[in-house]
């Protein structure tokens, strides 16, 4: 993503001394998603923004290193600094769900959503179903917004389909999912083929 | 069943913070996500914002960015609400309202705060 | 942001009449509009999702229609439980908005 590393960094070097101080406090405290370790505290109170910045994207990826920046800096009440980031994390499309799961489990191939991309997009009609089932959990409000945006079916799962490259594999489970409830012949007949 | 219990009452000082509870259970608390919603005295519903649980990701409507922050914890099957720098004008009843494909099935009994020096 | 208009604010029926509670959008809101009750005693439950589907263990006698702008929620047959406050709310945009209310009386 790089944007989002870019923005966190922006982010801490527009802090003063004490603020960056009391950033540093509040990230030892504040509570963290299942499955993340916490920054230890020696290390953490000797960092610079740069070293910081990199420290969050080490231990929580871009997406949810993002997220936790902003909240920290929400929590500190510089909500215009916040804002900032909400924007770049709106722009680059950073799908809090990708870092919801460990990387390694990102990159198997051959899921039934890559196989039959193609089949999805003729065949799916309705979308709109579907995205309601992904709304939050895998998409952003967002990209939800766009994909909706779009005038036909066909326009929509092209849509859809331009934000799975940056999924896990979880998000995916859920797509087949909700394509299960919606659409179960449909799906039946793509595993048969 | 689906429930959503609500912690109880509080009594704040004004320019203070609260953190309310919302404990699950009946379901599986990170297939869904956790919306707020405030009843001021005598007045309608308005929608504060939503925490999707598998993955923290939160949406807040503008007139309480910086009023709300949204938590959970899944060990304990929670979301949270704090409300920071509290006013007379935030004494009401809180709403947590569990969210399923976007609109809200089940709703908690709601908390009352009361902001009073 | 959506405004949800209900135009009435309270209303009064007698049990067994049939009672339709309005509501209207400031823009088209593609069906997603949900009705809920609030009883006197505070608990909210959702009625109607998507304009005219019925939550599970709501009775039949509640019903919803509409689309574009225009929506509303039919009680055939009321009865005394039905005493309560009713919402309309969209979830098309964010932010979610909710109508003022109809509060219905028993006569």
């Known amino acids: 993503m790089g944007r989002a590393r870019d923005a966190i960094l922006d982010a801490l070097e527009n802090l003063s001394g004490d603020e960056l101080k009391k950033f540093k406090m509040k990230l030892l405290t504040v509570q963290l998603r299942e499955g993340y370790g916490r920054i230890p505290r020696g290390a953490l109170l000797q960092m610079d923004a740069i070293d910081l910045t990199d420290k969050l994207v080490s231990y929580y990826l871009e997406s949810y290193g993002l997220e936790l920046t902003m909240t920290v800096l929400r929590d500190m009440g510089l909500q215009e600094l916040a804002e900032q980031l909400q924007t770049t994390k709106e722009e680059s499309g950073a799908v809090a769900a990708a870092a919801s799961v460990p990387a390694q489990s990102t990159a198997r191939t051959g899921h039934f959503v890559d196989q039959h991309r193609q089949a999805l997009i003729a065949r799916v009609t309705e979308v709109d179903g579907v995205l309601d089932a992904l709304h939050g959990s895998v998409l952003t409000e967002g990209q939800y917004q766009a994909v909706r945006a779009e005038t036909t079916s066909q326009d929509k799962m092209r849509k859809l389909f331009s934000f799975v490259p940056s999924w896990n594999l979880t998000c995916k489970d859920s797509l087949l999912q909700a394509l299960k409830e919606i659409h179960p012949y449909l799906v039946m007949d793509l595993e048969q083929s | 069943e689906v429930q959503l219990q609500q912690s109880g009452a509080e009594l704040v000082r004004p320019g203070s913070s609260v953190k309310m509870s919302c404990k699950t259970s009946?379901?599986?608390?990170?297939?869904?996500?956790i919306s707020w919603v405030i009843q001021r005295p005598e007045q309608g519903l308005e929608w504060i914002g939503y925490?999707?649980?598998?993955?923290?990701?939160?949406e807040y409507n503008e007139k309480f960015k910086g009023k709300a922050t949204l938590t959970s914890d899944t060990s304990s099957n929670t979301a949270y609400m704090q409300l920071s720098n509290l006013a007379s004008e935030d004494s009401a009843i809180y709403f947590c309202v569990r969210i399923h494909r976007r609109f809200f099935d089940y709703w908690g009994q709601g908390t009352t705060l009361t902001v009073s020096s | 942001d959506i405004q949800m208009t209900q135009t009435t604010s309270s209303l009064s029926a007698s049990l067994g009449d049939r009672v339709t509670i309005s509501c209207s959008a400031s823009q088209g809101i593609s069906n997603y509009l949900n009705w809920f009750q609030q009883k006197p005693n505070g608990t909210v439950r959702l009625l109607i999702y998507y304009t005219s589907s019925l939550h599970s263990g709501v009775p039949s006698r509640f019903s919803g229609s509409g689309s574009g702008t225009d929506y509303s929620l039919t009680i055939s047959n009321l009865e005394p439980e039905d005493i309560a406050t009713y919402y309309c709310q969209q979830y098309d945009r964010l932010p979610w908005t909710f109508g003022g209310g109809t509060k219905l009386e028993i006569k």
């Open positions: 009946g379901f599986t608390f990170t297939s869904y996500g």
């Open positions: 925490i999707y649980i598998r993955n923290g990701y939160t």
